[in-house]
């Protein structure tokens, strides 16, 4: 199937490319630049994934969460690990599968039923045919009790990016994740210099926008490591 | 059937720039990845760029890093391709690809089950 499509020689602690990078002579796929295929078998099971090292829920699948491997592991290693489903523990929604969320500690179905607070509905509209998605998975999306198909606006609760309007970014705030604007030119932003560093967080900045990238600013060059600002700079 | 539609091609100098919009219908664009290919006269299709679902990592071939910038607005199910510091050998036609996104892992051309028609991208030296 095609989440199986995965690679069991992958370079540990490099996040995985996202495409194949300039194609072989005579190859139909693309593969990454120094990642070999096994011979002949395109297709491996997940059992062959290897741990991506993460800072966010967002950078893993979206089957997935951002996570230390072992309990009360060091909170500076964190990798994607696999989602929880229905009735297993849980800290915060985005450990729970899709079509789940975290309540009082356990993944419990998005039903709207149990969840009126911040309703989060199930939408099993698929990107290709109208009736399933791929493997019976549904999308989640949150979505505010006064406005049930818009996406959340800043300040709303939210469990990943995708549910918030556009402009906006989920982030944590406290010990919850809400709809936050993503960072314009200028504004200060946060690099994070090693991985997992985001979980240290509690007041998580969004990413920059588009064509924007989190640097150095050009008159802090000078400062100590640790005092340096960064901001978002046009490319 | 999914439905993916590349706009924002055309005829430019080397040294310009152009933007390329990927635009899906259906919901579940939040939840895919999505590259983008080219493929030059004669030459076979090459990766060019990806973005994850949730727009927080994304790769780039070493041709154009550094030139090409890839985003994503998820409330629109639109893609971008920004392309600056054009060159002739950037003359392609472009891709926009979506596939499922529910691991963080290493992907092919296999992983992209939708592709669009494609959008012809000329640069004159």
């Known amino acids: 199937t095609l989440n199986s499509v995965l690679n069991s020689n992958a370079i540990k602690n490099l996040p995985p490319p996202l495409g194949g990078a300039a194609g072989h002579p005579g190859s139909a796929v693309s593969a990454a630049p120094g990642i070999l295929y096994p011979g002949g078998n395109k297709y491996q099971t997940i059992d062959n994934y290897q741990p991506y090292p993460c800072a966010e829920d967002e950078e893993c699948g979206t089957d997935e969460y951002c996570a230390s491997p072992t309990r009360g592991g060091d909170a500076g290693v964190q990798i994607c690990l696999a989602c929880r489903k229905r009735r297993k523990r849980c800290m915060r929604h985005a450990m729970c599968c899709p079509g789940n969320y975290c309540k009082n500690g356990i993944c419990v179905s998005s039903d709207q039923n149990h969840f009126r607070g911040e309703i989060e509905e199930t939408i099993t509209e698929s990107f290709g045919n109208d009736h399933s998605t791929l493997d019976g998975y549904s999308r989640r999306t949150t979505l505010s009790s006064k406005m049930y198909h818009t996406k959340g606006q800043e300040g709303s609760v939210c469990l990943r990016s995708s549910d918030c309007a556009s402009g906006l970014c989920c982030a944590r705030h406290f010990w919850s994740k809400i709809c936050k604007p993503v960072l314009k030119e200028g504004q200060v932003c946060t690099k994070h210099r090693r991985k997992g560093s985001h979980g240290l967080e509690i007041f998580q900045r969004c990413y920059c926008g588009e064509g924007l990238s989190c640097r150095i600013q050009k008159d802090h060059h000078q400062a100590s490591n640790s005092s340096r600002l960064h901001t978002c700079q046009r490319h | 059937e999914v439905q993916l539609v590349e706009s924002g091609g055309g005829l430019v100098q080397a040294g310009d720039s152009l933007r390329l919009s990927c635009t899906a219908s259906?919901?579940?664009?939040?939840?895919?990845?999505v590259g983008w290919f080219r493929q030059a006269p004669g030459k076979e299709r090459e990766f060019v760029t990806a973005i994850n679902w949730s727009g927080a990592r994304t790769d780039y071939a070493d041709s154009v890093k550094g030139r090409f910038t890839i985003s994503r607005n998820n409330a629109e199910n639109t893609a971008y391709l920004q392309m600056n510091s054009l060159k002739f050998e950037d003359t392609a036609v472009y891709y926009c690809?979506?596939?499922?996104?529910?691991?963080?892992?290493?992907?092919?051309?296999?992983?992209?089950?939708?592709w669009g028609q494609g959008t012809q991208v000329t640069v004159s030296s």
């Open positions: 690809a979506a596939g499922w996104d529910r691991y963080a892992r290493v992907l092919t051309e296999y992983d992209y089950v939708w």
């Open positions: 259906g919901s579940a664009f939040s939840r895919s990845v």
